[in-house]
Protein backbone atom coordinates (compact mmCIF):
# COMPACT_ATOMS: atom_id res chain seq x y z
CA UNK A 1 0.00 0.00 0.00
CA UNK A 2 2.77 2.39 0.84
CA UNK A 3 5.80 2.52 -1.41
CA UNK A 4 9.06 1.47 0.14
CA UNK A 5 11.47 4.16 1.26
CA UNK A 6 14.60 2.86 2.96
CA UNK A 7 12.82 -0.51 3.12
CA UNK A 8 9.77 0.81 4.97
CA UNK A 9 6.38 -0.66 4.09
CA UNK A 10 3.30 1.15 5.35
CA UNK A 11 -0.36 0.28 5.69
CA UNK A 12 -3.16 2.80 6.28
CA UNK A 13 -6.66 1.92 7.50
CA UNK A 14 -9.30 4.58 8.12
CA UNK A 15 -11.76 2.90 10.47
CA UNK A 16 -15.30 4.10 9.77
CA UNK A 17 -14.16 7.73 9.26
CA UNK A 18 -13.24 7.80 12.94
CA UNK A 19 -9.73 6.51 13.53
CA UNK A 20 -6.74 6.27 11.25
CA UNK A 21 -4.25 3.48 11.82
CA UNK A 22 -0.87 3.74 10.13
CA UNK A 23 1.41 0.77 10.61
CA UNK A 24 4.89 0.20 9.32
CA UNK A 25 7.19 -2.70 8.69
CA UNK A 26 10.82 -1.66 8.51
CA UNK A 27 13.21 -4.60 8.61
CA UNK A 28 16.21 -2.27 8.74
CA UNK A 29 14.78 -0.67 11.91
CA UNK A 30 13.23 -3.76 13.50
CA UNK A 31 14.84 -3.07 16.88
CA UNK A 32 14.30 0.67 16.75
CA UNK A 33 11.54 2.82 18.16
CA UNK A 34 10.63 4.82 15.10
CA UNK A 35 8.48 7.88 15.79
CA UNK A 36 5.41 9.00 13.86
CA UNK A 37 4.76 12.66 13.11
CA UNK A 38 1.64 13.92 11.36
CA UNK A 39 -0.50 16.87 10.40
CA UNK A 40 -3.82 17.33 8.63
CA UNK A 41 -2.97 20.59 6.93
CA UNK A 42 0.02 21.23 4.71
CA UNK A 43 1.02 24.44 6.46
CA UNK A 44 0.77 23.28 10.08
CA UNK A 45 3.58 22.03 12.30
CA UNK A 46 3.84 18.26 12.72
CA UNK A 47 2.41 16.67 15.87
CA UNK A 48 3.89 13.50 17.29
CA UNK A 49 1.79 10.39 17.78
CA UNK A 50 0.49 9.89 21.30
CA UNK A 51 -1.01 6.44 20.76
CA UNK A 52 1.61 4.05 19.40
CA UNK A 53 1.09 0.41 18.47
CA UNK A 54 3.85 -1.85 19.71
CA UNK A 55 5.24 -5.08 18.32
CA UNK A 56 7.82 -6.99 20.34
CA UNK A 57 8.33 -3.92 22.47
CA UNK A 58 9.01 -1.51 19.58
CA UNK A 59 6.79 1.00 17.83
CA UNK A 60 5.07 -0.43 14.77
CA UNK A 61 2.22 1.96 14.16
CA UNK A 62 0.10 4.87 15.31
CA UNK A 63 -3.60 5.32 15.98
CA UNK A 64 -4.98 8.80 15.30
CA UNK A 65 -8.35 10.24 16.21
CA UNK A 66 -9.61 11.57 12.89
CA UNK A 67 -13.38 11.61 13.21
CA UNK A 68 -14.86 12.61 9.84
CA UNK A 69 -11.69 14.45 8.94
CA UNK A 70 -12.00 15.59 5.36
CA UNK A 71 -8.29 15.73 4.93
CA UNK A 72 -5.06 14.60 3.52
CA UNK A 73 -2.86 13.03 6.18
CA UNK A 74 0.70 14.31 5.95
CA UNK A 75 3.06 12.09 7.91
CA UNK A 76 6.68 11.34 8.55
CA UNK A 77 8.15 8.22 10.15
CA UNK A 78 11.48 9.06 11.76
CA UNK A 79 14.49 7.43 13.33
CA UNK A 80 15.42 10.14 15.80
CA UNK A 81 15.45 13.27 13.65
CA UNK A 82 16.07 11.37 10.41
CA UNK A 83 12.95 10.79 8.28
CA UNK A 84 12.84 7.23 6.94
CA UNK A 85 9.43 7.57 5.23
CA UNK A 86 7.49 10.73 4.41
CA UNK A 87 4.23 10.84 2.51
CA UNK A 88 0.81 12.41 2.23
CA UNK A 89 -2.42 10.55 1.45
CA UNK A 90 -6.12 11.25 1.17
CA UNK A 91 -7.33 9.18 4.10
CA UNK A 92 -10.67 8.27 2.56
CA UNK A 93 -9.06 5.93 0.04
CA UNK A 94 -8.19 3.59 2.91
CA UNK A 95 -11.68 3.43 4.39
CA UNK A 96 -12.79 0.41 6.35
CA UNK A 97 -16.50 0.73 7.23
CA UNK A 98 -17.76 -0.52 10.54
CA UNK A 99 -19.45 -3.90 10.77
CA UNK A 100 -23.24 -3.84 10.23
CA UNK A 101 -25.28 -3.15 13.36
CA UNK A 102 -28.85 -4.07 14.30
CA UNK A 103 -29.11 -6.80 11.68
CA UNK A 104 -32.70 -8.00 11.34
CA UNK A 105 -34.38 -10.72 9.29
CA UNK A 106 -37.92 -10.56 7.98
CA UNK A 107 -39.24 -13.77 6.46
CA UNK A 108 -42.07 -14.13 3.98
CA UNK A 109 -42.52 -17.64 2.54
CA UNK A 110 -39.46 -18.43 0.40
CA UNK A 111 -37.82 -15.00 0.80
CA UNK A 112 -36.02 -13.10 3.52
CA UNK A 113 -35.30 -9.39 3.77
CA UNK A 114 -32.13 -8.57 5.67
CA UNK A 115 -31.90 -5.06 7.08
CA UNK A 116 -29.44 -3.20 9.26
CA UNK A 117 -28.63 0.37 10.20
CA UNK A 118 -27.24 2.30 7.24
CA UNK A 119 -23.96 4.04 7.94
CA UNK A 120 -23.99 7.84 8.03
CA UNK A 121 -22.06 8.13 4.78
CA UNK A 122 -22.85 6.81 1.34
CA UNK A 123 -21.46 5.07 -1.72
CA UNK A 124 -21.37 1.77 0.14
CA UNK A 125 -22.51 -1.75 -0.69
CA UNK A 126 -24.22 -3.92 1.90
CA UNK A 127 -23.44 -7.54 1.13
CA UNK A 128 -25.35 -10.54 2.52
CA UNK A 129 -23.79 -13.98 2.15
CA UNK A 130 -25.82 -17.09 2.87
CA UNK A 131 -25.66 -20.85 2.49
CA UNK A 132 -27.31 -24.07 3.58
CA UNK A 133 -25.38 -27.22 4.54
CA UNK A 134 -26.22 -28.50 1.05
CA UNK A 135 -24.45 -25.59 -0.68
CA UNK A 136 -20.81 -26.00 -1.60
CA UNK A 137 -20.12 -22.29 -1.39
CA UNK A 138 -21.60 -19.07 -0.11
CA UNK A 139 -24.18 -17.23 -2.22
CA UNK A 140 -24.05 -13.45 -2.20
CA UNK A 141 -26.37 -10.52 -2.80
CA UNK A 142 -25.61 -6.84 -2.30
CA UNK A 143 -27.47 -3.54 -2.43
CA UNK A 144 -26.49 0.08 -1.84
CA UNK A 145 -28.70 0.33 1.23
CA UNK A 146 -28.94 -2.18 4.02
CA UNK A 147 -32.17 -3.67 2.77
CA UNK A 148 -31.40 -6.85 0.89
CA UNK A 149 -34.11 -9.29 -0.19
CA UNK A 150 -33.11 -12.85 -1.05
CA UNK A 151 -35.70 -14.91 -2.86
CA UNK A 152 -36.03 -18.55 -3.82
CA UNK A 153 -35.01 -20.02 -0.48
CA UNK A 154 -36.20 -23.47 0.59
CA UNK A 155 -38.29 -23.05 3.74
CA UNK A 156 -37.29 -26.52 4.97
CA UNK A 157 -33.55 -25.85 4.81
CA UNK A 158 -31.45 -24.20 7.47
CA UNK A 159 -29.52 -21.16 6.21
CA UNK A 160 -26.56 -19.33 7.70
CA UNK A 161 -26.32 -15.59 7.03
CA UNK A 162 -23.80 -12.87 7.64
CA UNK A 163 -23.49 -9.30 6.46
CA UNK A 164 -20.69 -6.87 5.71
CA UNK A 165 -20.23 -3.41 4.23
CA UNK A 166 -17.93 -2.53 1.34
CA UNK A 167 -16.92 0.82 -0.12
CA UNK A 168 -17.88 1.22 -3.78
CA UNK A 169 -14.70 0.78 -5.78
CA UNK A 170 -15.67 3.27 -8.46
CA UNK A 171 -15.87 5.97 -5.80
CA UNK A 172 -13.31 5.00 -3.17
CA UNK A 173 -10.89 3.00 -5.30
CA UNK A 174 -9.20 -0.36 -4.88
CA UNK A 175 -7.40 0.24 -1.56
CA UNK A 176 -10.34 0.18 0.82
CA UNK A 177 -11.19 -2.70 3.16
CA UNK A 178 -14.51 -4.46 3.64
CA UNK A 179 -15.95 -4.29 7.12
CA UNK A 180 -15.68 -7.24 9.42
CA UNK A 181 -18.54 -9.66 8.98
CA UNK A 182 -21.49 -9.52 11.32
CA UNK A 183 -22.01 -12.58 13.47
CA UNK A 184 -23.34 -15.63 11.65
CA UNK A 185 -27.05 -16.12 12.19
CA UNK A 186 -28.82 -19.39 11.38
CA UNK A 187 -32.47 -19.61 10.34
CA UNK A 188 -34.91 -22.40 9.45
CA UNK A 189 -38.63 -22.13 8.72
CA UNK A 190 -38.46 -18.45 9.64
CA UNK A 191 -37.07 -19.19 13.09
CA UNK A 192 -33.61 -18.57 14.47
CA UNK A 193 -31.42 -21.61 15.18
CA UNK A 194 -28.25 -22.06 17.19
CA UNK A 195 -26.50 -23.56 14.19
CA UNK A 196 -27.08 -25.31 10.91
CA UNK A 197 -25.84 -28.90 11.02
CA UNK A 198 -22.69 -29.60 9.06
CA UNK A 199 -22.10 -25.95 8.16
CA UNK A 200 -18.36 -25.54 7.59
CA UNK A 201 -16.61 -22.55 9.14
CA UNK A 202 -17.01 -19.61 6.77
CA UNK A 203 -13.85 -18.12 5.27
CA UNK A 204 -12.57 -14.99 6.96
CA UNK A 205 -12.82 -11.78 4.90
CA UNK A 206 -9.57 -10.93 3.17
CA UNK A 207 -8.29 -7.59 4.42
CA UNK A 208 -4.96 -7.21 2.72
CA UNK A 209 -4.83 -5.74 -0.77
Amino acid sequence: QGGAAEGVQIQIIYFNLETVQVTWNASKYSRTNLTFHYRFNGDEAYDQCTNYLLQEGHTSGCLLDAEQRDDILYFSIRNGTHPVFTASRWMVYYLKPSSPKHVRFSWHQDAVTVTCSDLSYGDLLYEVQYRSPFDTEWQSKQENTCNVTIEGLDAEKCYSFWVRVKAMEDVYGPDTYPSDWSEVTCWQRGEIRDACAETPTPPKPKLSK
Partner: antibody, heavy 125, light 106 residues
Protein backbone atom coordinates in the same frame (compact mmCIF):
# COMPACT_ATOMS: atom_id res chain seq x y z
CA UNK B 1 -27.65 19.61 -14.75
CA UNK B 2 -24.67 20.63 -12.64
CA UNK B 3 -23.35 24.10 -13.43
CA UNK B 4 -20.63 26.27 -11.91
CA UNK B 5 -20.79 29.89 -13.05
CA UNK B 6 -17.92 32.20 -12.14
CA UNK B 7 -17.73 35.98 -11.96
CA UNK B 8 -16.21 37.99 -14.81
CA UNK B 9 -12.65 39.01 -15.58
CA UNK B 10 -10.85 41.41 -13.24
CA UNK B 11 -8.06 43.92 -13.85
CA UNK B 12 -6.31 44.91 -10.62
CA UNK B 13 -3.29 46.89 -9.54
CA UNK B 14 -0.49 45.34 -7.47
CA UNK B 15 -1.33 45.42 -3.77
CA UNK B 16 -5.08 45.39 -4.35
CA UNK B 17 -7.51 42.57 -3.51
CA UNK B 18 -9.90 40.56 -5.64
CA UNK B 19 -12.82 38.29 -4.84
CA UNK B 20 -13.87 35.67 -7.39
CA UNK B 21 -17.26 33.98 -7.02
CA UNK B 22 -18.45 30.56 -8.15
CA UNK B 23 -22.21 29.97 -8.12
CA UNK B 24 -23.31 26.34 -8.16
CA UNK B 25 -26.61 24.95 -9.38
CA UNK B 26 -28.13 21.61 -10.30
CA UNK B 27 -27.10 19.77 -7.12
CA UNK B 28 -27.08 20.15 -3.34
CA UNK B 29 -24.26 22.63 -2.79
CA UNK B 30 -23.26 21.32 0.63
CA UNK B 31 -22.90 17.71 -0.55
CA UNK B 32 -19.63 18.07 -2.45
CA UNK B 33 -16.37 19.87 -1.76
CA UNK B 34 -15.20 22.74 -3.96
CA UNK B 35 -11.61 23.16 -5.11
CA UNK B 36 -9.83 26.10 -6.67
CA UNK B 37 -7.35 25.61 -9.49
CA UNK B 38 -5.01 28.23 -10.96
CA UNK B 39 -3.70 28.39 -14.51
CA UNK B 40 -1.14 31.08 -15.31
CA UNK B 41 -0.99 32.28 -18.95
CA UNK B 42 0.35 29.52 -21.18
CA UNK B 43 1.03 27.34 -18.13
CA UNK B 44 -0.33 24.20 -16.57
CA UNK B 45 -2.88 23.61 -13.83
CA UNK B 46 -2.16 24.12 -10.14
CA UNK B 47 -4.46 22.98 -7.33
CA UNK B 48 -4.83 25.70 -4.71
CA UNK B 49 -6.84 23.74 -2.15
CA UNK B 50 -10.45 23.07 -1.34
CA UNK B 51 -13.26 23.93 1.01
CA UNK B 52 -15.68 21.53 2.66
CA UNK B 53 -19.03 23.08 1.75
CA UNK B 54 -20.71 21.24 4.62
CA UNK B 55 -18.48 22.53 7.41
CA UNK B 56 -16.90 25.57 5.73
CA UNK B 57 -13.51 24.15 6.60
CA UNK B 58 -10.88 25.36 4.08
CA UNK B 59 -7.68 23.51 3.24
CA UNK B 60 -4.89 25.25 1.37
CA UNK B 61 -2.21 23.62 -0.72
CA UNK B 62 1.40 24.47 -0.06
CA UNK B 63 2.16 27.86 -1.55
CA UNK B 64 -1.40 29.13 -1.18
CA UNK B 65 -1.52 30.10 2.46
CA UNK B 66 -1.70 33.65 3.79
CA UNK B 67 -2.97 35.78 0.91
CA UNK B 68 -5.58 33.30 -0.33
CA UNK B 69 -8.91 32.78 1.43
CA UNK B 70 -11.72 30.37 0.51
CA UNK B 71 -15.18 31.21 1.80
CA UNK B 72 -18.81 30.25 1.23
CA UNK B 73 -22.30 31.62 1.24
CA UNK B 74 -24.36 28.44 1.37
CA UNK B 75 -27.63 30.41 1.24
CA UNK B 76 -26.86 31.29 -2.38
CA UNK B 77 -24.79 28.15 -3.17
CA UNK B 78 -21.70 30.20 -3.85
CA UNK B 79 -18.00 29.69 -3.14
CA UNK B 80 -15.54 32.56 -3.09
CA UNK B 81 -11.82 32.94 -3.59
CA UNK B 82 -10.27 36.12 -2.22
CA UNK B 83 -6.68 37.09 -2.98
CA UNK B 84 -5.12 40.01 -1.15
CA UNK B 85 -1.90 41.96 -1.74
CA UNK B 86 -2.01 41.02 -5.41
CA UNK B 87 1.24 40.55 -7.30
CA UNK B 88 1.97 40.41 -11.03
CA UNK B 89 2.57 36.65 -10.70
CA UNK B 90 -1.03 36.18 -9.53
CA UNK B 91 -2.13 36.92 -13.10
CA UNK B 92 -3.95 33.74 -14.10
CA UNK B 93 -7.26 32.11 -14.85
CA UNK B 94 -8.82 30.83 -11.65
CA UNK B 95 -11.22 27.90 -11.83
CA UNK B 96 -13.59 26.48 -9.27
CA UNK B 97 -13.91 22.71 -9.63
CA UNK B 98 -16.34 20.42 -7.85
CA UNK B 99 -15.25 17.15 -6.30
CA UNK B 100 -16.75 14.54 -8.56
CA UNK B 101 -17.31 11.51 -6.39
CA UNK B 102 -16.66 11.80 -2.67
CA UNK B 103 -19.31 13.56 -0.61
CA UNK B 104 -18.45 16.18 1.99
CA UNK B 105 -19.42 13.97 4.92
CA UNK B 106 -16.57 11.71 3.85
CA UNK B 107 -14.18 14.38 2.64
CA UNK B 108 -12.67 15.06 -0.73
CA UNK B 109 -10.43 13.12 -3.00
CA UNK B 110 -9.16 15.38 -5.73
CA UNK B 111 -11.08 14.31 -8.84
CA UNK B 112 -12.81 17.12 -10.67
CA UNK B 113 -15.80 16.35 -12.89
CA UNK B 114 -17.40 19.79 -12.93
CA UNK B 115 -15.55 23.06 -13.59
CA UNK B 116 -16.48 26.72 -13.74
CA UNK B 117 -15.72 28.57 -16.95
CA UNK B 118 -12.76 30.31 -15.33
CA UNK B 119 -12.11 33.88 -14.21
CA UNK B 120 -9.15 35.77 -15.60
CA UNK B 121 -7.47 37.96 -13.00
CA UNK B 122 -4.91 40.35 -14.46
CA UNK B 123 -2.56 42.20 -12.11
CA UNK B 124 -0.83 45.11 -13.76
CA UNK B 125 0.23 48.62 -12.84
CA UNK C 1 4.99 16.85 -3.37
CA UNK C 2 4.36 14.22 -6.00
CA UNK C 3 5.73 15.42 -9.32
CA UNK C 4 4.01 14.41 -12.54
CA UNK C 5 6.02 14.37 -15.76
CA UNK C 6 4.30 14.09 -19.13
CA UNK C 7 5.83 13.23 -22.45
CA UNK C 8 5.92 14.41 -25.08
CA UNK C 9 5.22 18.07 -24.32
CA UNK C 10 3.83 18.49 -27.82
CA UNK C 11 2.78 16.11 -30.55
CA UNK C 12 1.70 16.48 -34.16
CA UNK C 13 -0.68 13.91 -35.60
CA UNK C 14 -3.33 13.44 -38.24
CA UNK C 15 -7.00 12.52 -38.08
CA UNK C 16 -7.27 8.74 -37.79
CA UNK C 17 -3.89 8.32 -36.11
CA UNK C 18 -3.39 6.34 -32.92
CA UNK C 19 -1.79 8.57 -30.30
CA UNK C 20 -0.17 7.74 -26.97
CA UNK C 21 0.73 10.19 -24.18
CA UNK C 22 2.68 9.04 -21.15
CA UNK C 23 2.78 10.31 -17.60
CA UNK C 24 5.24 9.40 -14.88
CA UNK C 25 4.78 10.00 -11.15
CA UNK C 26 7.71 10.68 -8.85
CA UNK C 27 6.39 8.05 -6.42
CA UNK C 28 3.94 5.17 -6.39
CA UNK C 29 0.39 6.49 -6.75
CA UNK C 30 -1.24 3.09 -7.36
CA UNK C 31 -4.06 3.85 -9.83
CA UNK C 32 -4.98 7.28 -8.45
CA UNK C 33 -4.56 9.06 -11.76
CA UNK C 34 -6.91 11.14 -13.88
CA UNK C 35 -6.60 12.49 -17.42
CA UNK C 36 -8.13 15.79 -18.57
CA UNK C 37 -8.58 17.43 -21.96
CA UNK C 38 -8.43 21.21 -22.25
CA UNK C 39 -9.22 23.32 -25.29
CA UNK C 40 -8.09 26.97 -25.61
CA UNK C 41 -10.17 29.32 -23.48
CA UNK C 42 -12.11 26.45 -21.91
CA UNK C 43 -12.04 24.61 -18.61
CA UNK C 44 -10.48 21.14 -18.42
CA UNK C 45 -12.73 18.13 -18.98
CA UNK C 46 -12.31 14.87 -17.07
CA UNK C 47 -11.71 11.94 -19.42
CA UNK C 48 -10.43 9.10 -17.25
CA UNK C 49 -10.02 8.34 -13.54
CA UNK C 50 -8.62 5.41 -11.58
CA UNK C 51 -6.07 5.34 -14.42
CA UNK C 52 -8.41 3.42 -16.73
CA UNK C 53 -12.06 4.17 -15.92
CA UNK C 54 -13.75 6.17 -18.66
CA UNK C 55 -15.79 9.11 -17.40
CA UNK C 56 -19.45 9.00 -18.44
CA UNK C 57 -20.01 10.54 -21.86
CA UNK C 58 -16.39 10.27 -23.01
CA UNK C 59 -15.93 8.46 -26.35
CA UNK C 60 -14.52 4.93 -26.17
CA UNK C 61 -11.59 5.85 -28.42
CA UNK C 62 -10.01 7.25 -25.26
CA UNK C 63 -8.40 4.71 -22.94
CA UNK C 64 -6.00 4.78 -20.05
CA UNK C 65 -3.66 2.24 -18.52
CA UNK C 66 -0.91 1.95 -15.96
CA UNK C 67 -0.32 1.56 -12.24
CA UNK C 68 2.34 2.63 -9.77
CA UNK C 69 4.41 5.30 -11.48
CA UNK C 70 3.88 4.85 -15.23
CA UNK C 71 0.65 5.68 -17.03
CA UNK C 72 -0.57 6.02 -20.60
CA UNK C 73 -3.45 7.81 -22.33
CA UNK C 74 -4.28 6.40 -25.75
CA UNK C 75 -6.56 7.84 -28.43
CA UNK C 76 -7.20 4.97 -30.82
CA UNK C 77 -8.29 7.00 -33.83
CA UNK C 78 -7.90 10.77 -33.65
CA UNK C 79 -10.94 12.87 -34.48
CA UNK C 80 -10.82 16.58 -35.38
CA UNK C 81 -12.28 17.54 -31.98
CA UNK C 82 -9.47 15.74 -30.13
CA UNK C 83 -6.82 18.36 -30.90
CA UNK C 84 -6.27 19.96 -27.50
CA UNK C 85 -3.95 19.91 -24.51
CA UNK C 86 -4.02 16.84 -22.25
CA UNK C 87 -3.08 16.79 -18.57
CA UNK C 88 -2.53 13.92 -16.17
CA UNK C 89 -3.27 14.48 -12.49
CA UNK C 90 -2.53 12.36 -9.45
CA UNK C 91 -4.90 12.33 -6.50
CA UNK C 92 -3.01 10.02 -4.18
CA UNK C 93 -1.98 13.01 -2.10
CA UNK C 94 -2.83 16.63 -2.71
CA UNK C 95 -3.53 16.92 -6.41
CA UNK C 96 -0.73 17.76 -8.81
CA UNK C 97 -0.90 17.95 -12.58
CA UNK C 98 1.53 17.13 -15.33
CA UNK C 99 2.82 20.03 -17.41
CA UNK C 100 0.53 19.13 -20.31
CA UNK C 101 0.85 17.63 -23.79
CA UNK C 102 -0.31 19.79 -26.68
CA UNK C 103 -1.76 17.68 -29.48
CA UNK C 104 -1.66 19.55 -32.78
CA UNK C 105 -2.78 18.83 -36.32
CA UNK C 106 0.05 17.68 -38.57
Amino acid sequence: QVQLVQSGSELKKPGASVKVSCKASGYTFTSYGMSWVRQAPGQGLEWMGWVNTNTGNPRYAQGFTGRFVFSLDTSVSTAYLQISSLKAEDTAVYYCAREGFIRTVVGAAGRFVYWGQGTLVTVSS
Amino acid sequence: DIQMTQSPSSLSASVGDRVTITCRASQDIHTRLAWYQQKPGKAPKLLIYWASTLQSGVPSRFSGSGSGTDFTLTISSLQPEDFATYYCQQYSAYPTFGQGTKLEIK
